[in-house]
Interface confidence: low
C-alpha cells in the first residue's frame, strides 16, 4: 500500500473497565486486571483509561498486482494505554517511573475496538478490476493483557521518568481485529 | 509496500556478541511492533521479542533475558538486536518481523545468518 | 509457555488434494493461532491469522478453524507452490511460540 497521510486524532479515548473481571478468557475479554500503580493513595480500582491515540490513515490498498482505485481512510490505533493515576505524570505531572509496579503481570494495549465492512475495487494494470470486501477500523480502546509471569520487565523501570508516557503496554489480541492485514 | 531489509550474514566467536539491523520501510515506523524470531539449521521458529518502535518499550522471551536486546532508532526507521554470550547453539538464521494488529507476524525481513564457531 | 503441537510432521499429497494440518495448543488460547508458510530459504509467509482470517493476497484454497485448543489450516485443491513447511503459532500469552512445523512436499 501507499500511505498519503496519517493524521492524529487522539481525543481521549475514556473508558472504563472493571476492576475484577473474570478471569476465564473469552473471545471479546482479556484476562484479569489492569497494571498496578503502586506507592500512591490513589484507587487501585480506577481503571478509567486515557491516551489511546486514534491516528487517521489515507492510503491506496494492493494485492500486488492491482491497486484500489480510490484511497482507503480508516483509524489505525496507537500502541499506548494510560491507567488514570499516571494521567498526571503524562501531562507533566511528578510521577515517574518508579510508581510502576515491579511484579504486576497485566499490561495494556490500544486496539481496535468498533470496525465495518466495505467493498472496495482494485485497478489491475491489465485494465481489469477486482473487487474486495475489507473491515476497516473505526474506533479504538483500551485492552487488557496479561502476561505469562517471569517475563523480562526491566525496561519499565529504566524509562526516564522525563517521558512518562513511554510506559509501554503488552497485548491481548482484540477479536474485532481489522480484517485486512495490509497496513 | 512494507519492506525490511536485514544486515548481512556474521560469522562470531564464542562468547561474543552480534547485533543485527533491520531497516523498514513503508508503513509508519513509530507505531509498529518489530518481533525478531530465530531459526536454527532444519529447525523450527523460535520468538526472541519484540519492541515498540515509538516508545522504545520491549518484552522478550525468558529464554534470552540477560542476552538479548532489542533496541529501535526511529531517525532511521532500523530496528536492532543484540545478542550476547554467543554459544555455538546460537548458529540460526534471524528474522525481524513487524507485528499486524496483535501479535501476528505479517512482513518478515530476509533473515540474516549468524554463525557461532571457533 | 504454551505449547503447540502440529500433526503430521510431514505429508505428501497430490495436486489437487485436500489436505489438513492440526494445530493443538496445551491450554486454551481462544482464537489467537495464526499459520505461516515457509518456503526453502525463504522467511516464512503469513496466510491466516486469528484462526481463520485470511491474509491479504493468500490464495482462496487456504483457510483456517478452530477455537481453544484444536486448530486447523485446510488446502483445497493443492498446488505445487504450496510446497513447504506450515507452521502454526500463538498469540495469546507471553512468550509467542510456534508449532514445530509440517513438512508438505508433492507426489
Known amino acids: 500500500f501507499k500511505n498519503d497521510a496519517t493524521e492524529i486524532l487522539y481525543s481521549h479515548v475514556v473508558k472504563p473497565v472493571p476492576a475484577h473481571p473474570s478471569s476465564n478468557s473469552t473471545l471479546n475479554q482479556a484476562r484479569n486486571g489492569g497494571r498496578h500503580f503502586s506507592n500512591t493513595g490513589l484507587d487501585r480500582n480506577t481503571r478509567v483509561q486515557v491516551g489511546c491515540r486514534e491516528l487517521r490513515s489515507t492510503k491506496y490498498i494492493s494485492d500486488g498486482q492491482c491497486t484500489s482505485i480510490s484511497p482507503l481512510k480508516e483509524l489505525v490505533c496507537a500502541g499506548e494505554c494510560l491507567p488514570l493515576p499516571v494521567l498526571p505524570n503524562w501531562i507533566g505531572g511528578g510521577y515517574g517511573t518508579k510508581y510502576w509496579s515491579r511484579r504486576s503481570s497485566q499490561e495494556w494495549r490500544c486496539v481496535n475496538d468498533k470496525t465495518r465492512t466495505q467493498r472496495i475495487q482494485l485497478q489491475c494494470q491489465d485494465g481489469s478490476t477486482r473487487t474486495y470486501k475489507i473491515t476497516v477500523v473505526t474506533a479504538c480502546k483500551c485492552k487488557r493483557y496479561t502476561r505469562q509471569h517471569n517475563e523480562s520487565s526491566h525496561n519499565f523501570e529504566s524509562m526516564s521518568p522525563a517521558k512518562p508516557v513511554q510506559h509501554h503496554r503488552e497485548r491481548k489480541r482484540a477479536s474485532k481485529s481489522s480484517k485486512h492485514s495490509m497496513s | 509496500q512494507v519492506q525490511l531489509v536485514q544486515s548481512g550474514a556474521e560469522v562470531k566467536k564464542p562468547g561474543s556478541s552480534v547485533k543485527v539491523s533491520c531497516k523498514a520501510s513503508?508503513?509508519?515506523?513509530?507505531?509498529?511492533?518489530i518481533s525478531w524470531v530465530r531459526q536454527a539449521p532444519g529447525q523450527g521458529l523460535e520468538w526472541m521479542g519484540w519492541?515498540?518502535?515509538?516508545?522504545?518499550?520491549?518484552r522478550y522471551n525468558r529464554k534470552f533475558t540477560g542476552r538479548v536486546t532489542i533496541t529501535a532508532d526511529e531517525s532511521t526507521s532500523t530496528a536492532y538486536m543484540e545478542l550476547s554470550s554467543l554459544r555455538s547453539e546460537d548458529t540460526a538464521v534471524y528474522y525481524c518481523?513487524?507485528?499486524?494488529?496483535?501479535?501476528?507476524?505479517?512482513?518478515w525481513g530476509q533473515g540474516t545468518l549468524v554463525t557461532v564457531s571457533s | 509457555d504454551i505449547q503447540l503441537t502440529q500433526s503430521p510432521f510431514s505429508l505428501s499429497a497430490s495436486v489437487g488434494d485436500r489436505v489438513t494440518i492440526t494445530c493443538r495448543a496445551s491450554?486454551?488460547?481462544?482464537?489467537?493461532l495464526n499459520w505461516y508458510l515457509q518456503k526453502p530459504g525463504k522467511a516464512p509467509k503469513l496466510l491466516i491469522f486469528?484462526?481463520?482470517t485470511s491474509q491479504s493476497g493468500v490464495p482462496s484454497r487456504f483457510s483456517g478453524n478452530g477455537f481453544g485448543t484444536d486448530f486447523s489450516l485446510i488446502i483445497s485443491g493443492l498446488q505445487p507452490e504450496d510446497v513447504g513447511t506450515y507452521y502454526c503459532?500463538?498469540?495469546?500469552?507471553?512468550?509467542?511460540?510456534f508449532g514445530q512445523g509440517t513438512r508438505l512436499d508433492i507426489k
Open positions: 513503508g508503513g509508519t515506523f513509530s507505531s509498529t511492533y
Open positions: 491450554q486454551s488460547i481462544n482464537d489467537n
Open positions: 486469528a484462526a481463520s
Open positions: 503459532q500463538q498469540n495469546d500469552s507471553m512468550p509467542f511460540t
Open positions: 519492541i515498540y518502535a515509538g516508545t522504545g518499550g520491549t
Open positions: 518481523a513487524r507485528e499486524g494488529v496483535d501479535g501476528w507476524f505479517t512482513y
